[in-house]
């Protein structure tokens, strides 16, 4: 499908010469016809915002250790998770660690594993979280 | 038929400029992407950028960023490139092709000669 | 922006087919469909044989087949012909408006 797009600025993003581009709306990127769009492809690419981009970006797929939370649409990339039992640290690029099986002595689990953090557990004798 | 007619060979001395045409003829200037490939002698051929001809919006590859500029008189349906501060390496010859579906070039002029030497 | 590689040179004798392999990166070959290859003869401009990985525009032989798998895509010529014999470049588009050529494969028909 093509859509006709619209003339916006879009300040100075390093492949255009000039800052007034033609930007395509989310979900579609530049058709080899100026002035004119294409969708992206369901579940295989995307584009999040509006864009001069002569293809949708490839979506991602999850890695093995990783399961998907919400699949690729036109306008949002894949979104994986650790799988049950793993948990990768927000914003960390490192692959998914085991869940700790329960808390050192002295100390008393407050929250479960996710795929988000480790269990968080406190001392049984203060109130502060402690993460391990 | 769709054709791109390039202009004549070029000689120019180092660190001089030189200005490219590339005419289309056959269809509607405006239509598609112009894109702008090089080769040099005995080389491979080397992507050098690209260009809107409706709104004159141009990409480059990073290495010739800040060193060419592409332009377009639609009044006579042909887009220019222009090459600053030229070496003994930008010797090559410059090719012009259209944007065809499926992000590729097709069809192409039949290309210009730059010689740069002093 | 380093170029695909192809290898230098292939050779086959009339009515052979002869398979270029053309390897990039996840970020170009491996990343979009977006996969042309080039005829190009001694003092020619380059020729479109292949897009989109496999498909041929019209025109162009069925003998000239094009096919992708991972970070590598390749062009089969089948049935070898004299006139097949030029130098062939392969393409990606690599993201972000920009395209990146093969170094060339020259092909002999032996």
């Known amino acids: 499908a093509t859509i006709k797009l619209h003339d916006q600025s879009i300040g100075t993003q390093q492949w255009e010469h000039s800052p007034l581009g033609e930007l395509c709306p989310p979900g579609s990127h530049r058709s080899e016809h100026p002035g004119a769009c294409n969708r992206c492809t369901e579940g295989v690419g995307y584009t999040n915002a509006s864009n001069n981009l002569f293809a949708c970006l490839p979506c991602t797929a999850c890695k093995s250790d990783e399961e998907e939370r919400s699949p690729c649409t036109t306008t949002r990339n894949t979104a994986c998770q650790c799988k049950p039992g793993t948990f990768r640290n927000d914003n960390s690029a490192e692959m998914c660690r085991k869940c700790s099986r329960g808390c050192p002595r002295g100390m008393v689990k407050v929250k479960d594993c996710t795929p988000w953090s480790d269990i968080e557990c406190v001392h049984k004798e203060s109130g502060n979280g402690h993460n391990i | 038929e769709v054709q791109l007619v390039q202009s004549g060979a070029e000689v120019k001395m180092p660190g001089a400029s030189v200005k490219l045409s590339c005419r289309v003829s056959?269809?509607?200037?405006?239509?598609?992407?112009i894109h702008w490939v090089r080769q040099a002698p005995g080389q491979g051929l080397e992507w050098m950028g690209w260009?809107?001809?409706?709104?004159?919006?141009?990409g480059s590859a990073e290495k010739f960023r800040g060193r060419v500029a592409m332009t377009r008189d639609t009044s006579i349906s042909t887009a220019y490139m222009e090459l600053n501060r030229l070496t003994f390496d930008d010797t090559a010859v410059y090719y012009c092709?259209?944007?065809?579906?499926?992000?590729?070039?097709?069809?192409w002029g039949q290309g210009t000669l730059v010689t740069v030497s002093s | 922006q380093s170029a695909l590689t192809q290898p230098a040179s292939v050779s086959g004798s009339p009515g052979q087919s002869i398979t270029i392999s053309c390897t990039g990166t996840?970020?170009?070959?491996?990343?979009?469909?977006?996969v042309s290859w080039y005829q190009q003869h001694p003092g020619k401009a380059p020729k479109l044989v292949i897009y989109?990985?496999?498909n041929r525009p019209s025109g162009v032989s069925s003998r000239f087949s094009g096919s992708k798998s991972g970070q590598t895509a390749s062009l089969t010529i089948s049935g070898l012909q004299a006139d097949d014999e030029a130098d062939y470049y392969c393409?990606?588009?690599?993201?972000?408006?920009?395209?990146?050529f093969g170094g060339g494969t020259k092909v002999t028909v032996l």
């Open positions: 989109e990985v496999s």
């Open positions: 056959g269809d509607t200037f405006t239509a598609y992407f």
């Open positions: 393409n990606s588009y690599q993201g972000y408006n920009t395209w990146v």
């Open positions: 092709a259209r944007q065809h579906r499926g992000n590729t070039f097709d069809p």
């Open positions: 996840s970020s170009d070959i491996g990343a979009y469909k977006y």
């Open positions: 260009f809107n001809p409706i709104s004159g919006t141009a």
